[in-house]
C-alpha cells in the first residue's frame, strides 16, 4: 500500500462530490481531491454505501455501482494517506441519489426477465395497484453491447401480467455473460413511478426443449439419444428423462447430470447430442419418453428454470387388451 504522512494526521475532506446516472441503472459518483492535503501524502479514498456496505479503498476519484434505482442510495467518501483500513479517514462526505418521483403504489411490481435460449429476453410485470386500467407501459433496456438505451417494441399481455420481449443473443466475447441487462418500465404519460431491475446474464436462463433423436433397445435397456437446444454445451445442462410404460402404467423419472454418448450402442460424434441408458425396460411393451433440461451451476448462477418438455417419442409394442 502507499506510504505517506503519519497515520495520526487526518486529511481534509474530499470536494465537489457529485452523483449521476448513466444508461438506466449505472450510478456514478465523482469527486475532487481535498484542498490542502499534506504534500507528503499519496492520497487514497475510502468509500462505502450508506449501510456500511462494500467498503473500498482506492486511488481513483470515482466510484460506480450498477443498482436498480427503486430506492435511495448514498455513498460516503473520505480521504486518507494509505491503504490501511485502520487509518482514520477524513470527515466523510455523503451524496445520495433518489429514485424518480411518483406514488410507490403506482409502480409496476414483479418485474422480472427470463433469457430464453440465450437468444431473446422476455420481461413481465404486474401493474401497480394505484394505476388506471388504461395505462400504456414502455420497457427500456440497456446492456454493454448496445450503444444506447433501447425501447422494447413487442408489448403483450398474459393474463394479468404485461410483458415485452427483445432480441438478446449471446455474443462470443467471453466476458459477455459476466454483465447484466438493465431494465426500466414506466408509462407513456409519465404518471407512474418508474421501476427498475438488473438481470445478470448468468441467471434466469430458460433453454429451449431438447429434441429426441433416437430410441433403441439393447437387451432390457432402453437407449435414449437427444439433441440439446442450440447455444448450450452439454456440460452446462442438467437433464430430466421421463419414461412412461403403457402396460405397467409406471412413470419413471431419471435425473441426469452427465449424459455422454460413450456406449457403443449410441450413434457417435454427433454434435451437441446427449445420451442416457434407462435400465430394465420391457421391450415388448410401449414406452414413451420425454426430456427436459435446465442450466446447471457449473456454468450459470441459476438452476431453477426447466425448459418445456420435449416432444414425446415412443418405442415398443402396445399390447392388445384381451
Amino acid at each position: 500500500g502507499g506510504g505517506g504522512a503519519a497515520p495520526t494526521e487526518t486529511q481534509p475532506p474530499v470536494t465537489n462530490l457529485s452523483v449521476s446516472v448513466e444508461n438506466l441503472c449505472t450510478v456514478i459518483w465523482t469527486w475532487n481531491p481535498p484542498e490542502g492535503a499534506s504534500s507528503n501524502c499519496s492520497l487514497w479514498y475510502f468509500s462505502h454505501f450508506g449501510d456500511k456496505q462494500d467498503k473500498k479503498i482506492a486511488p481513483e476519484t470515482r466510484r460506480s455501482i450498477e443498482v436498480p434505482l427503486n430506492e435511495r442510495i448514498c455513498l460516503q467518501v473520505g480521504s486518507q494517506c494509505s491503504t490501511n483500513e485502520s487509518e482514520k479517514p477524513s470527515i466523510l462526505v455523503e451524496k445520495c441519489i433518489s429514485p424518480p418521483e411518483g406514488d410507490p403504489e403506482s409502480a409496476v411490481t414483479e418485474l422480472q426477465c427470463i433469457w430464453h435460449n440465450l437468444s431473446y429476453m422476455k420481461c413481465s410485470w404486474l401493474p401497480g395497484r394505484n394505476t388506471s386500467p388504461d395505462t400504456n407501459y414502455t420497457l427500456y433496456y440497456w446492456h454493454r453491447s448496445l450503444e444506447k438505451i433501447h425501447q422494447c417494441e413487442n408489448i403483450f399481455r398474459e393474463g394479468q401480467y404485461f410483458g415485452c420481449s427483445f432480441d438478446l443473443t449471446k455474443v462470443k466475447d467471453s466476458s459477455f455473460e459476466q454483465h447484466s441487462v438493465q431494465i426500466m418500465v414506466k408509462d407513456n404519460a409519465g404518471k407512474i413511478k418508474p421501476s427498475f431491475n438488473i438481470v445478470p446474464l448468468t441467471s434466469r436462463v430458460k433453454p429451449d426443449p431438447p429434441h429426441i433423436k433416437n430410441l433403441s433397445f439393447h437387451n432390457d435397456d432402453l437407449y435414449v439419444q437427444w439433441e440439446n437446444p442450440q447455444n448450450f454445451i452439454s456440460r452446462c445442462l442438467f437433464y430430466e428423462v421421463e419414461v412412461n410404460n403403457s402396460q405397467t402404467e409406471t412413470h419413471n423419472v431419471f435425473y441426469v447430470q452427465e449424459a455422454k454418448c460413450e456406449n457403443p450402442e449410441f450413434e457417435r460424434n454427433v454434435e451437441n447430442t446427449s445420451c442416457f441408458m434407462v435400465p430394465g425396460v420391457l421391450p415388448d411393451t410401449l414406452n414413451t419418453v420425454r426430456i427436459r433440461v435446465k442450466t446447471n451451476k457449473l456454468c450459470y448462477e441459476d438452476d431453477k428454470l426447466w425448459s418445456n418438455w420435449s416432444q414425446e417419442m415412443s418405442i415398443g409394442k402396445k399390447r392388445n387388451s384381451t
Epitope: E105, T109, E110, L126, P127, R129, N130, T131, S132, P133, E158, G159, Q160, Y161
Partner: antibody, heavy 118, light 107 residues
C-alpha cells in the same frame, strides 16, 4: 369452462385452525391472482386476502393479518387459505375468486362455510 | 382505505321499472369500480367492470356510469330474475372494499 371450487370448510372451535383449498380449471392459472372473499351470515362481502399469479405478491385484510396465510401451488392449480387462531367473527361463507384485468373478480366459486363456535 | 357508500340499502320494485343504484367513494378512484350481483344462496357474479364496461354474458338492461367518486348502476326494465343484492367494489389500491350492498326486491 373456467371454474373455481372451494373445499375445507367446517365447524371449528375458537382458537382452532382450518385450511381451505380452491381448485381452479379452464385457464392458465399462473397468470392470474386469486382472492378470498368472505360473507358473514346475513352480511355483505369482505375482502380477505389476495395472492398474485406467481405468488410473489401477497396481501391481507387487517382483520386477518398474522392469523391467515394464503399460498398457491401452480403445478396443482390450487390456492390455499390457512386459517389459525380462529374467532367467532371469522364465521362466514368463504369464496374463492379469480382476478382479472385491473383488478376485478370475474369468476367466483360456490363458497365453503366456516363456522367458529364452541 | 376507500369507503364505498351505496344507496338505497333496500328497494322494492315492480317488473319493467327502471332501477338506479348509486355508489359514492370517499375519494376519487377513477374508473376502478366494479358492480356485482348476488342472488339468494348463490355466489356473486360480475355485472360491470371499470364503472361502465359490461361483462360478457350480462343482459344489456344492466349498465354502469360514473367516474371519480360518484357511480351508478342502472337496470332498465327490471325482470323478476333480477331480485338480488348488488355490491359495488373499489379496486384502486388495497384493501379492496365493497359497498354495504343494495337489496332489490321484486313486488
Amino acid at each position: 369452462e373456467v371454474q373455481v371450487l372451494e373445499s375445507g370448510g367446517g365447524l371449528v372451535q375458537p382458537g382452532g385452525s382450518l385450511r381451505l383449498s380452491c381448485a381452479a380449471s379452464g385457464f392458465t392459472f399462473s397468470n392470474y391472482a386469486m382472492t378470498w372473499v368472505r360473507q358473514a351470515p346475513g352480511k355483505g362481502l369482505e375482502w380477505v386476502s389476495t395472492i398474485s399469479g406467481r405468488g410473489y405478491s401477497i396481501y391481507y385484510a387487517d382483520s386477518v393479518k398474522g392469523r391467515f396465510t394464503i399460498s398457491r401451488d401452480n403445478s396443482k392449480n390450487t390456492v390455499y387459505l390457512q386459517m389459525n387462531s380462529l374467532r367467532a367473527e371469522d364465521t362466514a361463507v368463504y369464496y374463492c375468486a379469480k382476478e382479472e384485468g385491473h383488478w376485478y373478480f370475474d369468476v367466483w366459486g360456490r363458497g365453503t362455510l366456516v363456522t367458529v363456535s364452541s | 382505505e376507500i369507503v364505498l357508500t351505496q344507496s338505497p340499502d333496500f328497494q322494492s320494485v315492480t317488473p319493467k321499472e327502471k332501477v338506479t343504484i348509486t355508489c359514492r367513494a370517499s375519494q376519487s378512484i377513477g374508473s376502478s369500480l366494479h358492480w356485482y350481483q348476488q342472488k339468494p344462496d348463490q355466489s356473486p357474479k360480475l355485472l360491470i367492470k371499470y364503472a361502465s364496461q359490461s361483462f360478457s354474458g350480462v343482459p344489456s338492461r344492466f349498465s354502469g356510469s360514473g367516474s371519480g367518486t360518484d357511480f351508478t348502476l342502472t337496470i332498465n326494465s327490471l325482470e323478476a330474475e333480477d331480485a338480488a343484492a348488488y355490491y359495488c367494489m373499489s379496486s384502486l389500491g388495497l384493501p379492496y372494499t365493497f359497498g354495504q350492498g343494495t337489496k332489490l326486491e321484486i313486488k
